[in-house]
Interface confidence: low
């Protein structure tokens, strides 16, 4: 008997809280040789589905929603699951999606940080202008 | 099967250029990192150059030893990685390997410039 | 830059040994490190990444261990086919440094 699959993750990018007209994506990952993740909204009424899936470190893959342009009807709650060898994973934590301005310059960054499901620090290609990493088990999204 | 492979090697005059280009198959290329790491007759690895995916803007870094001289490419569309390489230098003169990202797990057989006049 | 010092630079040793090679990253690359085999001629191979992590299809007589600035590479019981040129890199950030490498031969 197999047994249960990991708990699939969900992290946003740049943070949760974006304002209208931004981009965001929305991250899930999940172990290496996943079949497809859904994103699904909270009452599971919308949801997309992905094979697009890439190996974001040794030991998970991933799957990028990207939302280019947010605005208020994104807003709201969305998790993860995934597919792998035919059966379905269970969800992952709710991920709070707000849309809503910035106090500052709306063209720079958002800084605000993600809600306790997201990412966590990683390695960067500069190490001067990006959070240094805890340890190697983490996203390794900045190597693709 | 993953393959990588290079091509476009050869002899070139010092502030000369070349394009080598890397053909690739066997793997989701438009989701991978690539790079170009390169070794000197005799010596040690150099890694030289790296383009990230579309999700990342194609973002480029590259060694300072060929920053502002040489240019990464991709073509998602044709699984290809490309090294436009201008005002050769002696010292260029090396194996230049297309790598696969992000653990350089997957290494072409290489293609060998020589830049003498 | 990070330096990566790769230490020795040559090693001799006999078929059945175990060697160890050591490589010290100029500040903490967490776990980031990798290690490489070059034969003569060929391209390098992916032994171990993620300091630690064997790649697929490694025998299991290579080992890696380490973390911060402080990594090394075991293998045991030494085969012919193993008499090469090893190298580490690290994968922090870039550029992606190499160590200098180390070449083992047949004592």
């Known amino acids: 008997q197999e047994g249960p699959l990991p708990r699939p993750s969900i992290s946003a990018e740049p943070g949760t809280v974006i304002p209208p007209g931004r981009p965001v994506t929305i991250v899930c990952r999940g172990p290496v040789g996943v079949d497809q993740f859904r994103l699904e909204r909270e009452d599971r009424s919308k949801f997309n589905d992905t094979k697009d899936v890439s190996q974001a470190s040794p030991s998970e893959s991933e799957a990028r929603f990207r939302i280019d342009s947010v605005s208020e009807g994104n807003a709201g709650h969305y998790r993860c699951l995934y597919v792998k060898s035919t059966r379905w994973s269970e969800h992952s934590d709710y991920l709070d999606l707000v849309v809503k301005e910035t106090s500052g310059d709306t063209d720079s960054p958002v800084t605000e940080p993600d809600s306790s499901a997201g990412p966590t620090q990683r390695p960067s290609d500069n190490s001067h202008n990006e959070h240094a990493p805890a340890s190697q088990g983490l996203s390794a999204e900045h190597l693709y | 099967e993953v393959q990588l492979v290079e091509t476009g090697g050869g002899l070139v005059q010092p502030k000369g250029s070349l394009k080598l280009s890397c053909a690739t198959s066997?793997?989701?290329?438009?989701?991978?990192?690539m790079n170009w790491v390169r070794q000197a007759p005799g010596k040690g690895l150099e890694w030289v150059a790296r383009?990230?995916?579309?999700?990342?803007?194609?973002?480029?870094y590259y060694a300072d030893s060929v920053k502002d001289r040489f240019t990464i490419s991709r073509d998602d569309s044709q699984s290809m990685l490309y090294l436009q390489m201008n005002n050769l230098k002696t010292e260029d003169t090396a194996m230049y390997y297309c790598?696969?990202?992000?653990?350089?797990?997957?290494w072409g057989q290489g293609t060998t410039l020589t830049v003498s006049s | 830059d990070i330096q990566m010092t790769q230490s020795p630079a040559s090693q001799s040793a006999s078929l059945g040994e175990s060697v160890t090679i050591t490589c010290l990253a100029s500040?903490?690359?967490?776990?980031?490190l990798a290690w490489y085999q070059q034969k003569p001629g060929k391209s390098p191979q992916l032994l171990i990444y993620?300091?630690?992590s064997l790649a697929d299809g490694v025998p299991s007589r290579f080992s890696g261990s380490g973390s911060g600035t402080k990594f090394s590479f075991k293998i045991s019981n030494l085969q012919a086919e193993d008499f090469v040129t090893y190298y580490c890199?690290?994968?922090?950030?870039?550029?992606?440094?190499f160590g200098g490498g180390t070449k083992l031969e047949i004592k």
């Open positions: 993620a300091a630690t």
């Open positions: 790598v696969r990202g992000p653990y350089f797990d997957y």
């Open positions: 066997g793997f989701t290329f438009n989701i991978n990192a």
């Open positions: 383009i990230r995916t579309k999700n990342n803007n194609f973002a480029t």
């Open positions: 500040q903490t690359i967490g776990t980031w």
């Open positions: 890199q690290q994968l922090y950030s870039t550029p992606y440094t």
